[in-house]
């Protein structure tokens, strides 16, 4: 993820981003790019915009992509069927 600044809520981030938990410091949230094709994801990550504070360190997939299971516990952003 590209660090583009600390945040608290999605509304503080630019387009194509969400305010996700830092993978380095769990107490910090940073504006993080939404999932691109092939990126890891979680199907229950809150959609954008979310008005609370996220717990996941990944953002939802970009529009047109879906978070799909590829194996028992692995999900990646793939083109929507």
């Amino acid at each position: 993820a590209v660090i583009t600044g600390a945040c608290d809520k999605d509304s503080q981030c630019g387009g194509g981003m969400c305010c996700a938990v830092s993978i380095w410091v769990k107490s910090i949230r940073i504006c993080t790019p939404m999932g691109k094709l092939g990126d890891s994801c979680h199907p229950l990550t809150r959609k954008v915009p979310f008005f609370g504070r996220r717990m996941h360190h990944t953002c939802p997939c970009l529009p047109g992509l879906a978070c799909l299971r590829t194996s028992f516990n692995r999900f990646i952003c793939l083109a929507q069927k």
């Epitope: 979680h42 229950l44 990550t45 609370g52 996220r54």
Partner: antibody
Framework: EVQLQQSGPEVVKTGASVKISCKAS????????MHWVKQSQGKSLEWIGY????????TYNQKFKGKATFTVDKSSTTAYMQFNSLTSEDSAVYYC??????????????WGQGTSLTVSS | DIVLTQSPASLAVSLGQRATISCKAS??????????MNWYQQKPGQPPKLLIY???NLESGIPARFSGSGSGTDFTLNIHPVEEEDAATYYC?????????FGQGTKVEIK
Amino acid sequence: EVQLQQSGPEVVKTGASVKISCKASGYSFTDYDMHWVKQSQGKSLEWIGYISCYNGATTYNQKFKGKATFTVDKSSTTAYMQFNSLTSEDSAVYYCARDGNYGEAYAMDYWGQGTSLTVSS
Amino acid sequence: DIVLTQSPASLAVSLGQRATISCKASQSVDYDGDSYMNWYQQKPGQPPKLLIYAASNLESGIPARFSGSGSGTDFTLNIHPVEEEDAATYYCQQINEDPFTFGQGTKVEIK
């Protein structure tokens, strides 16, 4: 004070449809999702799904797809659940519950009082 | 679907003592270092009330005698010291996988 006021008890015929309402007050309606939960007599709780009160996006428990339909009316801060093709298995108390916005914990922090649905033949 | 099994089904606890309720999940409900398990209390004729979210976080306004712990597949709700008003049915709920599922409930009676 956050309040969720649900519509009154319903007694309907097998095969009919019913629409339950959940009027929200005391908070910014569009900032929170609304869940719907089923509780059959003397049984546990069953999650039906939820709707974004911001943009109307829905997520349904696969078991209730085609059975339940969620909608929201932002102007009246009311969420609705329509249940169709009713059978005796649908007789239960149905709750709306606000999502608490605790990240991906999807915790339901305020609940309506419940709407009793009885399906009779 | 993730199956949650609560035990015991019911228990009677003396006033001031500890009530311990277990919830076992059929698979892990952890992700990224967090445990996605909630606990609710329900009294007869009332809707459920949120007690604990994300395994161990006490909901605002809930007395500190309620606490939650656990990770992976094994979770516990503790009530200590138990008070008269704690007589209720308690449910665990997992929110790590769609569909979200609830345990079958544990009924707590006060002796």
